[in-house]
Structure formats: C-alpha cells, structure tokens
C-alpha cells in the first residue's frame, strides 16, 4: 500500500501575485484534508461564514482516484498573506512533503512595501550560521543587511539570500550587532524590513540557585524577596520566568539583575512581593531558559497569620544516659516563627555557651549531669513564652 | 536599580581635553544588553548624541560625525565605569553632558541617564 | 543624518486638557527606534516612550505614543500639574538625532 499524496491546482512551487487580488487553490486527495496557510487563525474558518481576513475553506468536487477535495479561498490577499500554503491529510499525524501533503509558497507583492516581517528578537549563539527571518512579499529582490555600523552583501557563502526565509549568514559576522534589518531597492525608493533586536547568547548556563533554598516562611504583611541567579557562560543571555500561587492575579514583580564576571555571567530575576497574606502561600518556581537549556529551581513558601512558638518533647521528659558517654543529646520538637530568644537552664541555673533551641549537646557525660534541664522560649515584641523542662538520670555503670 | 553617577571637571580651557567618567551600579557595562552613552545639550545645539560603547564579544564604539575626529569613549571593566574624552575644546562645547544607558528591552532608548554634568570652555 | 523636527515649539494648555506632540522624520524611520522623553528644569530627560507606542517601567498610562515612517505623535490625555515639561522625541536607528523640543506649559 502506497499513499497517494495530495495535489493542487497550482502546479508552481511557488506562485506570485498581487495585492488586492484574490486567490484560489484546489486541493484533492485520497483522505480527509486540511489547509495551513499564513493568515490562517487557529481553527479555520468553514462553510459559508466568509471572513476577508483568514480566508475560507470549502468542499469541493473530487475525483475518482482522489475524492476528497478542499478550496481554499481568500479575498484582496495582502502582504501579510505571502508564505506557504499546504493542503494535508487530516488524519495522518506525519505532515510530509510529496507523502502526506502538498504545497505552494505564495508570494503576494506590495511594492509600497515588500518587507513582512515584525520586529522581533534574534537569539545568536555560537552555531556556524543562522537565518536572519526578514520575509519578502516579492521574489528576486536584491537584498542587504544591515546593522547599525555596518553593511552585509549576499556573497554565496558567508551570507546567502533567500527569497522565503531571509538571509543565512555566518553568526561571526552577528556578534558586535545591535540590530538587524534587511534593505533593498525597488524602482528608486529604498526600504528597510522592521528592524531584529540581537541578542548574543552563550551556549551553556552552569548552575541555577534559588534563594532563600528550601522553604521561607514569613508573617501575613511581610514582605516576600526571593533571588534567581543563574551562572552562565559569559556575556550569555537568559530568560526568567516564575510560577507561584499568585502570578495570575500579577502579585509582585520581577526585576531582573546581571553581573559579568572575567570567567562568567551571572544574571538574577528577584521577585517581591510586598504585604504577603494566606493566598501567597505555595511553591514558587523560578525558570531560566536560554533557548538552548531550561534550568528550574522551586521553594516553599509558609505564610503564618500570627506571631507563634510550639515546643514539645521529642523522646518524652525523661532521657537516659551512661556516665562517660561522650556527646548526649536532648532533643525538643520546636516549631516557632519568627525565630525566638532561647535559653537553656540546668537545675534553674543558665548555661553559658552557644546552643541550639533544637537540642542541647552535652559532652563528657558524668554523674554530675543529672539534674532537670529547662528551655525558655520567649518572643518579646509578640507577648509570647514557651518553657519545657526534660529529666535527665545519668546511670553509672 | 540601576544608577549612573558622572563625575568630572566643570571648566575646562580651550583647546585642553574635557574628561568625564560615569560609574554604573545596577548593571555592568560588560553586559550583552546594554549600550553606554554620552549626550550633551546646550541652547545653541539641544540634545546632542556623542557616541557609545557596548561589548559583543568585543568592545566596540560608535561616534556621532561631528565629533569623531576628537572624541574617545572608553570602557573600564574593573570599576565599572566608562569615560568621555573630547580633545581640543572650544567655546562651542560648553554644555551640560550626560552619561546614559540604552537597553535592548527598550530598542536602546535611553532609559536610565546620569544627573548632568556643566562643562563650561573658557580660559 | 535624520532630522526630526518638531511641532509646535511651544504649547499652551490648561490642567485637564489633551496635549498633542507632533514629531517628523527627514526620512522614514522604524517605529522601533523612536521614542520619547520629558525633560523638566534642572534634570535630565526621562523616558517616556519606546519603539513609537510602548509606554517605559513605571510611566503613567494617560501618556500615549503613534505613528509610523515620518510621522510620529506623543499625546497626554489629560494634563496634571507634573506633566508641564519640555518634550523630545529621538531616533535611534542609525545615528542617533534629537528633535528641537516642544515646550508644554501652563496657559
């Protein structure tokens, strides 16, 4: 079994026309069809429901060996209208050239203005040679390049001009642009295409760091800052986006920062969000692309509606240990925001030295450690205090 | 933020060289994005551009014509900053200079520019 | 060397009124590379305006930006105490020109 692949009625590879006029192409097959064409919206237009601007699509009469037949019809086409116009089969997933579908690159002429392209931006990188996409809405144009310092000509072979995708040039000739845009002449009056930002990328981001890193837990009315930083090769581009519960409804912005370094770039987004409530509670996500690689990064956010310290024992209020131990450990389960002043006391008295709300550390255990030893917690601004007291029985052995 | 702080002389002499240096914080004039430029006005000729520097792999400068015999704008990496050099004043360069920076995210318009800086030629 | 020029040099208006800048080019230009700024006494310009209509980070919406090939228009809708200032349109293309101002005060 061999598919028969559509055919048109415009035999041409391509076909030229002019502003104002209509157009007509015919399309048979041996399967249900579609058409793809440059102003098409997302779902065609059908039927009788005539739009001037996207076009219609038809039934038509087939044939025996191809029954299936689509129209495609369009109105006082426009340059907007150049590009190509395939007619494929609906059904079958693969859209292949002389298998599935056929086509016919259109060009509509407008010599008030042959360029189509909008402006947009150019990612540069270090591959040999790139397309710099300004479309023509006439054929066989003698076309340059231009930057803002300097003029490409067409030679073959460091630049190559094609009347459907533009210009093809060595990216070495790209990297001091700032911007691009394609001139030509036509009769006496010179045009430019609308003008391509260049953006100069590095190939590789390194690394990807969100901070604060795992979670970042803050009172309703404070304020939210996390920092995105991306390590990249240097004088590379990157784009940031963010997900969090709160981006639909445009909550916080975005600022983006960039750091070059001699080795590397480093290049940040820091997201804020100001007067957080219960509604900005979830993960937030911070993506970083260079149309190359995607690196993400995700944190918790923990909003609490008050001030709050919640202390209870970890292994019950009376620890055991073994005189001559060296290293004991008395844990509590703490749960506090924001952190709380702490002190630990033995037998009422404080203890000096540095410790941890979460545990107290003994080292050297002796029979002398046996004792009651207490946690104060306290957050004087909230009005809060929290004690809990563990035994300990030190045994000797 | 991004911030542009000029320093430099008030009055220089004619046929001397006028030097003024623009310190950046918030961006670095190393970055891919961005370009460093000098403007001056002064009654007589408005809002002038002067020329720019911008490093794409490499550092490159453009100049405005009625300048480019005589002016120099450098770069300088380690204090992040860029320089204005005009050689041979005279009279007709009294004005108020300014540094500023055009970003891609805007067409490199101008979008963050130094306070100003009134360089009067006289003897 | 583009010339913009711009009209009128001076425009007399009161709080609350539409105020209308007109900017021409010498020769077309591309929409991306215009903008404009609003200077006031003693300070330098501030962007307003790029690529003809995209108004900058943090520039109310009453100012509006149009226009394409030599013929560009700045306009404020309704006049606050703070819009009273001396306006420039630029060209950013190729070389890079000013136009001469226009000046916004009150009537």
């Known amino acids: 079994y061999s598919m028969t692949p559509p055919t048109l009625n415009i035999t041409e590879e391509s076909h030229v026309i002019d502003t104002g006029d209509s157009l007509s192409i015919s399309c048979r097959g041996q399967h249900p069809l579609e058409w793809a064409w440059p102003g098409a919206q997302e779902a065609p237009a059908t039927g009788d429901k005539d739009s001037e601007d996207t076009g219609v699509v038809r039934d038509c009469e087939g044939t025996d060996a191809r029954p299936y037949c689509k129209v495609l019809l369009l109105h006082e086409v426009h340059a907007n209208d150049t590009g190509s116009y395939v007619c494929y089969y609906k059904y079958i997933k693969a859209r292949i050239e002389g298998t599935t579908a056929a086509s016919s690159y259109v060009f509509v002429r407008d010599f008030e203005q042959p360029f189509i392209n909008k402006p947009d931006t150019l990612l540069v990188n270090r591959k040999d040679a790139m397309w710099v996409p300004c479309l023509v809405s006439i054929p066989g144009l003698n076309v340059t390049l231009r930057s803002q310092s300097s003029v490409l000509w067409p030679d073959g072979q460091e630049v190559v001009w094609d009347d459907r995708r533009g210009m093809l040039v060595s990216t070495p000739l790209l990297h001091d642009a700032l911007y691009l845009q394609c001139e030509t002449t036509w009769g006496d009056q010179d045009f430019l295409s609308n003008p391509f930002l260049v953006h100069i990328t590095g190939n590789e981001l390194y690394d990807i760091q969100l901070l604060p890193r795992k979670s970042l837990e803050l009172l309703v009315g404070e304020k939210l800052v996390l920092n995105c930083t991306v390590w990249a090769e240097f004088n590379s581009g990157v784009t940031f986006d963010w997900d969090y519960p709160g981006k639909q409804a445009e909550r916080g912005k975005w600022v983006p920062e960039r750091r070059s370094q001699q080795t590397h770039t480093e290049l940040s987004s820091i997201l804020t969000i100001h007067n957080v409530s219960q509604h900005d509670l979830g993960s937030y996500v911070c993506k970083a692309n260079n149309g190359i690689q995607r690196f993400r990064e995700s944190t918790e956010v923990i909003v609490h509606e008050n001030p709050f310290i919640s202390v209870e024992w970890l292994k019950g209020p009376i620890l055991e240990a073994t005189a001559g131990d060296e290293l004991v450990k008395l844990p509590v389960k703490l749960a506090a925001y924001p952190p709380p002043e702490f002190q630990w006391y033995k037998d009422g008295k404080a203890l000096s030295g540095r410790h941890s709300p979460h545990a107290l550390v003994l080292k050297e255990v002796t029979e002398a450690s046996t004792g009651t030893y207490t946690l104060a917690l306290w957050n004087s601004a909230a009005g809060l205090r929290r004690n809990i007291s563990l035994e300990l029985v030190v045994n000797v052995p | 933020q991004v911030q542009l702080q000029q320093s430099g002389p008030g009055l220089v002499k004619p046929s001397q060289t006028l030097s003024l240096t623009c310190a950046i914080s918030?961006?670095?004039?190393?970055?891919?994005?961005?370009?460093w430029n000098w403007i001056r006005q002064s009654p007589s000729r408005g809002l002038e551009w002067l020329g720019r520097?911008?490093?794409?792999?490499?550092?490159?400068?453009d100049y405005a014509e009625s300048v480019k015999s005589r002016i120099t704008i450098n770069p300088d990496t380690s204090k992040n900053q860029f320089s204005l050099q005009l050689n041979s004043v005279t009279p007709e360069d009294t004005a108020v200079y300014y540094c500023?920076?055009?970003?891609?995210?805007?067409?490199?318009?101008?979008?963050?520019w130094g306070q100003g800086t009134l360089v009067t030629v006289s003897s | 060397e583009i010339v913009l020029t711009q009209s009128p040099g001076t425009l007399s208006l009161s709080l609350g009124e539409r105020a209308t800048l007109s900017c021409r080019a010498s020769?077309?230009?591309?929409?991306?590379?215009l903008a404009w700024y609003q200077q006031k006494p003693g300070q330098a310009p501030k962007l307003l305006i790029y690529?003809?209509?995209t108004r900058a980070t943090g520039i109310p919406d009453r100012f509006s930006g149009s226009g394409s090939g030599t013929d560009f228009t700045l306009t404020i809708s309704r006049l606050e105490p703070e819009d009273f200032a001396v306006y420039y349109c630029?060209?950013?293309?190729?070389?890079?020109?000013f136009g001469g101002g226009t000046k916004v005060e009150v009537k």
């Open positions: 500023a920076r055009g970003d891609s995210s805007s067409w490199y318009a101008f979008d963050y």
């Open positions: 918030g961006d670095s004039v190393s970055g891919n994005s961005a370009t």
């Open positions: 520097t911008y490093y794409r792999s490499k550092w490159n400068h």
């Open positions: 020769q077309s230009i591309s929409s991306s590379f």
């Open positions: 690529a003809a209509s």
């Open positions: 630029q060209q950013y293309g190729r070389s890079l020109s």
